[in-house]
Amino acid sequence: EVEKTACPSGKKAREIDESLIFYKKWELEACVDAALLATQMDRVNAIPFTYEQLDVLKHKLDELYPQGYPESVIQHLGYLFLKMSPEDIRKWNVTSLETLKALLEVNKGHEMSPQVATLIDRFVKGRGQLDKDTLDTLTAFYPGYLCSLSPEELSSVPPSSIWAVRPQDLDTCDPRQLDVLYPKARLAFQNMNGSEYFVKIQSFLGGAPTEDLKALSQQNVSMDLATFMKLRTDAVLPLTVAEVQKLLGPHVEGLKAEERHRPVRDWILRQRQDDLDTLGLGLQG
């Protein structure tokens, strides 16, 4: 806490400018009007204040806005954001994606601090869902963000947001997460034609049920083995030999190399040997 002292004559700040870097902490406290600071927050970042001086500026804003800063101030916090505590941030109501981007940019290159985690949480909860633009922003700043969300959190992702998801965003997702995301992707891409649809849906297929795999087998998609190996075992087991052959197309030969691994192994054991023999791969049921 900085002691309350009168501002020396002639030192009253008329605007936020470089001259303030020569002010002692008590002078900043006494001579800078909090309302002036709030309206000229965008200037603070251009001025090389010390951490101690930034503490004083934060203190002034805290006094002016005890219930939490307005978004007009938050958007221009810049490096002052790094001084905020999660408790400070919980008082905020951040609704603008531009504000979120501005603050994430300030934190770029730093670890995802508890402050940033709180900010993201407040923002997403405020919006009520993880919309496309927000998802775009968060995955750009933090690759892997999508797969760090629980299935419950993912359920708040609207299908329209799925257009923002890149294959690499799903790299670390587990089967339960894909179970949630797949139906959303199916809905999002439903109006695309066969080959384009498959390109988009491919990364999500770890959550696909049997009936959708059967439908895909009728569309000459030529699924690669890497994708096939990530399918749900319970979804693969009911497929017939003919359906798997159609699903994989020229990649069907790859089944031989994977015959001891799930889901291929379990699928083979469910098939009639006569049917397996039609593949000519020497698979033994």
Epitope: E111, A117, L149, P151, T172
Partner: nanobody, 121 residues
Framework: QVHLVESGGGSVQAGGSLRLSCVAS????????MRWYRQGPGQVRDWVSS???????SYTDSVKGRFTIAQDKGKNTVYLQMNSLQPEDTAMYYC???????????????WGHGTQVTVSS
């Protein structure tokens, strides 16, 4: 560098229990999702269970109701309590952590070296 060390594996009779532990170190201040995988003889690694940043959990169907994942965030440790073990649960069990938003060497995900679980009938 991020390190994961699993322990708690061993040999048990069918119907028995084991509690696996995984201690993570070398990171802080980021979103972490901890997962258990297992790899049976001649098999690929299969996902078993996850505990997400918000503390919720999920399981593969074959272990639901028998296995429980839990974490002690203060100790950066995740546990897998395995009850009613069956011979099909025999495998090397691996811990994996996915980190988002922290500056650490190497790329997420990170894996431990595994702990062997053998269940005899």
């Amino acid at each position: 560098q991020v390190h994961l060390v699993e322990s708690g594996g061993g040999s048990v009779q069918a119907g028995g229990s084991l509690r696996l532990s995984c201690v993570a170190s070398g990171y802080r201040n980021c979103r972490s999702t901890m997962r258990w995988y297992r790899q049976g003889p001649g098999q690929v690694r299969d996902w078993v269970s996850s505990i997400y940043t918000d503390g919720t959990t999920s399981y593969t169907d074959s272990v639901k109701g028998r296995f429980t994942i839990a974490q002690d965030k203060g100790k950066n440790t995740v546990y897998l309590q395995m009850n009613s073990l069956q011979p099909e649960d025999t495998a090397m069990y691996y811990c994996r952590i996915d980190l988002v938003g922290c500056n650490v060497a190497g790329g997420s995900p990170y894996w431990g070296h595994g702990t062997q679980v053998t269940v005899s009938s």
